[in-house]
Interface confidence: low
């Protein structure tokens, strides 16, 4: 079943079929006898009840308010009311671009890496039974694809695939022909899976500390998925029970790179932790990058130039 219209603010293009489906649909079936009403308010008009006689373009079916098609003057607020349930939507109908096969404000942007899997499938589940045929256009030129019911592109992306892809569904309703357009702006970007990993921040960091206190040394890097980030300290790692490597945190950027962060926690700082190197290293197939931290007693920090301190 088609999901309900949960978004409170909706923008649609004039001249296309459109529907609003309230989100207590299953409940409405259980209480058929309950009065269910749809209202519209816009500008000076306050809460005008809608029914099929309101306009030849409006149809009401169970949980759905349909527009055949939606027009500029349908802009406004819509309400569904049933017993003690109310749902509200704000509908903004925008002008169709008469000079293009799509309207720029109704474009979904997607970024695809070159050589990665790229797919466009033309589907419209709500109007599926009414759709006669569907065409897929690239930059407003029709693509000749085998399946004219649900045209699909499935391939490994190439730079030439960049462009605007428009799925246009043609359907009949009450003897009239309508179309619904969904456009994707596909940007193909360089395969960025192998950047040169870099540790962020200064290469040498003096950290002012107090004996007996705790400190957290944060090491951050921009790296590839398969790269590793690790801490090295002392003669053999793990010999000091007061030193703990925290779990590595990674977040992915939209371009498929990774920001990694790994914290070294030193508890109950002692003399043995001072003036020794705590090294953080990022390693990849292309080499390594290392940055160092040195713990310095707060009282001694006057001896060190200010610019070497971490913020």
């Amino acid at each position: 079943a088609e999901s309900c219209t949960s978004r409170p603010h909706i923008t649609v293009v004039e001249g296309e079929p459109f529907y609003l489906k309230h989100c207590s649909c299953s409940l409405a079936h259980e209480i058929e006898t309950t009065t269910k009403s749809w209202y519209k308010s816009s500008g000076s008009q306050e809460h005008v009840e809608l029914n099929p006689r309101s306009s030849s373009r409006i149809a009401l079916h169970d949980c759905v308010l349909e527009f055949w098609p939606v027009e500029l003057n349908d802009t406004g607020s819509y309400f569904f009311q049933m017993k003690n349930y109310t749902q509200k939507w704000k509908l903004n109908v925008i002008r169709r671009n008469k000079h293009s096969c799509f309207t720029e404000r109704q474009v979904t942007s997607k970024i695809v890496e070159v050589k990665k899997f790229f797919q466009i499938t033309c589907e419209n589940s709500y109007y599926q039974t009414l759709v006669n045929s569907t065409s897929l256009y690239k930059n407003c030129k029709k693509l000749l694809l085998e399946n004219n019911k649900n045209p699909t592109i499935k391939k490994n992306a190439e730079f030439e695939d960049q462009g605007y892809y428009s799925c246009v569904h043609f359907l009949h309703h009450n003897g009239k022909l309508f179309n619904i357009t969904k456009t994707f702006n596909i940007t193909i970007v360089e395969d960025r899976s192998n950047i040169v990993p870099v540790l962020l921040g200064p290469k040498l960091n003096h950290v002012a500390v107090e004996l007996g206190k705790n400190v957290r040394l944060n090491c951050s890097a921009l790296l590839n998925e398969e790269d590793v980030i690790y801490w090295m300290f002392g003669e053999e790692n793990g010999s000091d029970p007061n030193i703990h490597e925290e779990k590595e945190m990674r977040i992915m950027t939209p371009e498929g790179k990774w920001h990694a962060s790994k914290v070294l926690r030193i508890e109950n700082i002692g003399e043995s932790n001072l003036n020794v190197l705590y090294n953080c290293t990022v390693a990849s197939t292309g080499g390594t990058d290392t940055k160092s931290f040195i713990l310095v007693r707060k009282a001694d920090m006057a001896d060190i130039p200010g610019h070497v301190f971490t913020r």
Partner: antibody, heavy 118, light 112 residues
Framework: QVQLVQSGAEVKKPGASVKVSCKAS????????MHWVRQAPGQGLEWMGW????????NYAQKFQGRVTMTRDTSISTAYMELSRLRSDDTAVYYC???????????WGQGTLVTVSS | DIVMTQSPDSLAVSLGERATINCKSS????????????LAWYQQKPGQPPKLLIY???TRESGVPDRFSGSGSGTDFTLTISSLQAEDVAVYYC????????FGQGTKVEIK
């Protein structure tokens, strides 16, 4: 310290090409993307494209595709931007800018003024 | 492309007073996977290249005075100079780096 030093001002005739250079120092040249941004006199900033100095891969703004070519010479840590079929509205200051990884631009060159005039 | 619109185009503020510049993007530049807004602010003085002030919408670049601050999320962003100094006279640009890179048209800040 990080420095991006660009080539000097150029005067070109319409239809000609111009090649601007950007020499990087103070960091690992192949570790950061290099972008080119231009600014027409009294106008705002316009992104033109980037080059990955490590692989030589490029990505150009749609507006400049077919007219712009970005290259690099890793042996001298220099990025180049060549713009062909120049028009008078290409008169602008052209900047190179370093990018830590498809993000914001943390260092900029001083700019190169390209004047296109018949 | 994502269109960035700044307001006002120019702003005259007395020394020591607050200056506020707004920037609106035509679509959200917030990326839910890492909770970041892909927006930066730059300062450009006459005859100089732009200088990075703020990135991730609110993170101040190292060395930038703390009178500069950035705020906002999604499509609406603000750069605030809490107490305008003579050296802050410049043109300020917002830039999105979510899908390619686009800049606002710039806001000129002058002393009243």
């Amino acid at each position: 310290q990080v420095q991006l030093v660009q080539s000097g001002a150029e005067v070109k005739k319409p239809g000609a090409s111009v090649k601007v250079s950007c020499k990087a120092s103070g960091y690992t040249f192949t570790g950061y993307y290099m972008h080119w941004v231009r600014q027409a006199p009294g106008q705002g900033l316009e992104w033109m494209g980037w080059i990955n100095p490590n692989s030589g891969g490029t990505n150009y703004a749609q507006k400049f595709q077919g007219r712009v070519t970005m290259t690099r010479d890793t042996s001298i840590s220099t990025a180049y931007m060549e713009l062909s079929r120049l028009r008078s509205d290409d008169t602008a200051v052209y900047y190179c800018a370093r990018d830590m990884g498809d993000l914001f631009f943390d260092y900029w060159g001083q700019g190169t003024l390209v004047t296109v005039s018949s | 492309d994502i269109v960035m619109t700044q307001s006002p185009d120019s702003l005259a503020v007395s020394l020591g007073e607050r200056a506020t510049i707004n920037c609106k993007s035509s679509q959200s530049v917030f990326y839910s996977s890492n909770n970041k807004n892909y927006l930066a602010w730059y300062q450009q003085k006459p005859g100089q290249p732009p200088k990075l002030l703020i990135y991730w919408a609110s993170t101040r670049e190292s060395g930038v005075p703390d009178r500069f601050s950035g705020s906002g999320s999604g499509t609406d962003f603000t750069l605030t100079i809490s107490s305008l100094q003579a050296e802050d006279v410049a043109v300020y640009y917002c830039q999105q780096y979510f899908i390619t890179w686009t800049f606002g048209q710039g806001t000129k800040v002058e002393i009243k």
